[in-house]
């Protein structure tokens, strides 16, 4: 799915007014990305509990297991983002898969992801049938990681 | 930094030809995202070795440590992506931070990220000074995770 952009003009890149109204489905088709998180969403109970499974997706087999929470905004590209939520404060023992080991912390890995928001163009509200895509950095938690606790110097 | 889009037209959203040439810096300014990976790039030696540090960024404190490798494409938004490369085949012991534990595997967590490519508009090569942004899913490894080995049923 492509987006046609005109080069030049004062705002990078700036386009001419439209002759017709774009069907909402078109924007949604273009803006919707893969609505799946990095790992398939597991609907079994263990994906939500503090234990490391021996099967299933990576987030439930991890010794720092996590679940995914959907963040949906239809004015954003991508529309759907997933935030990892750690299911344990400490890492789960590799031996048992259930008991927590206080030597390790289960912590979220954050990332500033590039996203785009559909906005009215500056100073053009209600005049033209055009819109702006505004690039922003959006903080998401990607996964939970088992780390050794930080030792302060 | 905004991108102005015209609504309507047969291609979603489609723009008129430009009157002038856009300065390269403008596209690059708009398309360049945060050039830092989820964790700050560590230039110390331990970030590249198979051990779990007690300080430093999350990727070096993890018991499934990883380094970040840059993926740069100036025709893509974001221009810079980072791929996680696992530094150990197994997880590092929480006790020692150096010896590997065969009970756990250190594996990459993959994600199909939404990216956009700058392309000539279909059937318009050499004619108009406009371009298309093509949405694609691009596979990146986000981090390395310590998991219990999968037990096949």
């Amino acid at each position: 799915v492509s987006l046609r952009i005109q080069e030049g003009c004062s705002h990078l890149p700036s386009c001419c007014p439209s002759k017709e109204q774009e069907p909402p489905e078109e924007w949604l088709k273009w803006s919707s990305a893969s609505v799946s998180p990095p790992e398939p969403l597991s609907h079994t109970h263990h994906a939500e509990s503090c234990r490391a499974s021996k099967d299933g997706p990576l987030n439930s087999r991890a010794i720092s297991p996590w679940s995914y929470e959907l963040d949906r905004d239809l004015n954003r590209v991508p529309q759907d983002l997933y935030h990892a939520r750690c299911l344990c404060p400490h890492c789960v023992s590799l031996q048992t898969g259930s008991h927590m080991d206080p030597l390790g912390n289960s912590v979220p890995l954050y990332h500033n992801q590039t996203v785009f928001y559909r906005r009215p163009c500056h100073g053009e509200e209600g005049t033209h049938r055009r819109y702006c895509l505004e690039r922003r950095l959006y903080r998401v938690s990607l996964a939970c990681v088992c780390v050794r606790p930080r030792v302060m110097a | 930094v905004s991108l102005r889009i015209q609504e309507g037209c047969s291609h979603l959203p489609s723009c008129c030809p430009s009157k002038e040439q856009e300065p390269p810096e403008e596209w690059l300014k708009w398309s360049s995202a945060s050039v830092s990976p989820p964790e700050p790039l560590s230039h110390t030696h331990h970030a590249e070795s198979c051990r779990a540090s007690k300080d430093g960024p999350l990727n070096s404190r993890a018991i499934s440590p990883w380094s970040y490798e840059l993926d740069r494409d100036l025709n893509r938004v974001p221009q810079d992506l980072y791929h996680a490369r696992c530094l150990c085949p197994h997880c590092v012991s929480l006790q020692t931070g150096s010896h590997m534990d065969p009970l756990g595997n250190s594996v990459p967590l993959y994600h199909n990220q939404t990216v956009f490519y700058r392309r000539p508009c279909h059937g318009e090569e050499g004619t108009h000074r406009r371009y298309c942004l093509e949405r694609r899913l691009y596979r990146v490894s986000l981090a390395c995770v310590c998991v219990r080995p999968r037990v096949m049923a």
Epitope: - | P24, S32, Y131
Partner: antibody, heavy 125, light 108 residues
Framework: QVTLKESGPTLVKPTQTLTLTCTFS??????????LGWIRQPPGKALEWLAH???????HYKPALKSRLTITKDTSKNQVVLTMTNVDPVDTATYYC?????????????????WGQGTLVTVSS | EIVLTQSPATLSASPGERVTISCSAS?????MYWYQQKPGQAPRPLIY???NLASGVPARFSGSGSGTDYTLTISSMEPEDFATYYC???????????FGQGTKLEIK
Amino acid sequence: QVTLKESGPTLVKPTQTLTLTCTFSGFSLSTSGMGLGWIRQPPGKALEWLAHIWWDDVKHYKPALKSRLTITKDTSKNQVVLTMTNVDPVDTATYYCARMGQLHYYGYDYAMDYWGQGTLVTVSS
Amino acid sequence: EIVLTQSPATLSASPGERVTISCSASSSVSYMYWYQQKPGQAPRPLIYRTSNLASGVPARFSGSGSGTDYTLTISSMEPEDFATYYCQLYHSYPPTWTFGQGTKLEIK
């Protein structure tokens, strides 16, 4: 107009470090999208890319030679320096520096659009 | 690392003849670039981004292709076209530039 010129020793002994300088004019390496690379060509053989440095000081190296190469830039002097450690007779080649930095309406070009004339480096004891 | 294989390695042609040089990538790539090199000279760009002619390059040169297979065509050979031709690509991860091994165009 854009010009690039390579300079450095013509003869280097095995195990020594080779230092090559590319002095350029007609463009600035601080301009977004601008980059400069080093390419070599052993006598009678093909071109081989070695290293690249971008306007924002991001550097890339040929994986097989990464441990031996270092590329740096001095924007104020309009110079890029390539150092290669532990040279061997197989490193005998003409070394070129080349610019990259063309953005067309259809996108950024990853071609080297301007080249220096090259400098022949012989590695021999 | 992606490998580029050019064929043929050497090609003999006569002025006025149509010539085609192939470049095959070991995995799919988005674009290909082409250079011409004459003895004792630095390479000069011919084709940008698969099919766009570099400045000052005669229209008898053209480029095409997609995926793994790319082609440089000279519609009617001129005496000044006898040279060595290289294909080149850029790969974003890890960021690397790769050249083909070259095709030498000789006068028949």
